[in-house]
Interface confidence: low
């Protein structure tokens, strides 16, 4: 079989809300993936599992099941949302994210995603990791690729 390519495109949007009393930030982060089927037969995208890390702590997880099928030599763009919570030992971030004297409150998050595809009973998993900027101070819609954070820690692709 030929390859199935998974490309993490970036953060599409981030919607934020706060709990003042608990000093907690809730971020709903929607990400975009391109999945390309280089085969001459259809494949099923069985599930997508994703998690988001901040400062090496997992702050959100999501799983999508029975998502779609991709035809031969075809590509599909898939959006998935991960609800995240920045709280407890990270509640110090609340002050930064609600600081009104600055306009952009970017934090660096690590996006991890694993796509499971199946064809002819065979299952294949492809994983990606990317560091992304997300504004935790207001609702933001990003141009694809706009939120990318490049640094020496980013895994080689």
């Amino acid at each position: 079989p030929r390859s199935i390519d998974v490309k993490y495109i970036g953060v599409k949007s981030a919607y934020v809300s706060y709990d003042v009393q608990k000093r907690t930030i809730y971020l709903n982060i929607t990400n975009t993936l391109n999945i390309t089927n280089n085969n001459y037969y259809s494949v099923e995208v069985e599930n997508i599992t994703a998690q988001v890390q901040f400062a090496k702590t997992v702050i959100g997880k999501a799983r999508l099941n029975n998502i779609t099928h991709i035809g031969p030599l075809d590509m599909k763009q898939i959006d998935y949302t991960v609800p995240t919570v920045i709280a407890e030992e990270m509640s110090y971030m609340y002050d930064f994210c609600t600081l009104i004297s600055i306009k952009v409150h970017n934090i660096v998050l690590m996006m991890q995603v694993t796509v499971t595809t199946t064809y002819f009973g065979h299952s294949e998993q492809i994983s990606q990791e990317r560091y992304q900027y997300v504004d935790c101070g207001r609702n933001t819609t990003y141009q694809l690729g706009q939120s990318e954070y490049l640094n020496v820690l980013q895994p080689q692709q």
């Epitope: 809300s17 706060y18 003042v20 994210c97 609600t98 600081l99 009104i100 004297s101 207001r138 609702n139």
Partner: antibody, heavy 122, light 107 residues
């Protein structure tokens, strides 16, 4: 219940400055922003700026950056606006209002003070 | 800055009549809009937040809605105490901006 009690009317000379207060009660002062709004006689409402009483951080409308200074005293649950180099254009009613803790997210300005009239005249 | 264009600037209506006031936003503000009421003595009260949510204690005859960039405040049946001034306020971005106001007068 939530109350924002503003100081009384002021009659001040041109070129001087004035400080208007807004005393908050009935809620946790540092959990909310205090916003300030100007209303000239017979005119509409104009946003001046906002202060986070917890840390003292401020955000001003460009128009009022050199005119207004916002401060807050956590110990007395009171916010202040100081207006400097006063001219007749500054004659107005000044309102304080309370908002949730982010200037970008939330329902904004849920409770208002009664307003303080500032008259600049020689 | 986001401009909020409020119309009409004044409106004459009769008791029991249904009226609508409109604010148009120059940029996308989502649902981040309030409607405020100002009494003749200057007192300001929030009637509606987040475009359509009624504040507690506000009579049910007040309602808010949105169509694209147009935001409306509707009073279903005018009562004598409703003949005051109304403002919209956007809080989607800093600086917050107000509509120019609508003075509601009794016919």
């Amino acid at each position: 219940q939530v109350q924002l009690q503003q100081s009384g009317p002021e009659l001040v000379r041109p070129g001087t400055s004035v400080k208007v207060s807004c005393k908050a009660s009935g809620y946790a002062f540092t959990n909310y922003l205090i916003e300030w709004v100007k209303q000239r006689p017979g005119q509409g409402l104009e946003w001046i700026g906002v202060i986070n009483p917890g840390g003292g951080n401020t955000d001003y409308s460009e128009k009022f950056k050199d005119k207004a200074t916002l401060t807050a005293d956590k110990s007395s649950n009171t916010a202040y606006i100081q207006l400097s180099s006063l001219t007749s254009e500054d004659s107005a009613v000044y309102f304080c209002a309370r908002s949730p803790y982010s200037s970008y997210v939330g329902y904004a300005v849920d409770y208002w003070g009664q307003g303080t009239s500032v008259t600049v005249s020689s | 800055d986001i401009q909020m264009t409020q119309s009409p600037s004044s409106l004459s209506a009769s008791l029991g009549e249904r009226v609508s006031l409109t604010c148009r936003a120059s940029q996308d503000i989502g649902s981040n809009l309030n409607w405020l009421q100002q009494e003749p003595d200057g007192t300001i009260k929030r009637l509606i937040y987040a475009t359509s949510s009624l504040d507690s204690g506000v009579p049910k005859r007040f309602s808010g809605s949105r169509s694209g960039s147009d935001y409306s405040l509707t009073i279903s049946s005018l009562e004598s105490e409703d003949f005051v001034v109304y403002y919209c306020l956007q809080y989607a971005s800093s600086p917050r901006t107000f509509g120019g106001g609508t003075r509601l007068e009794i016919k």
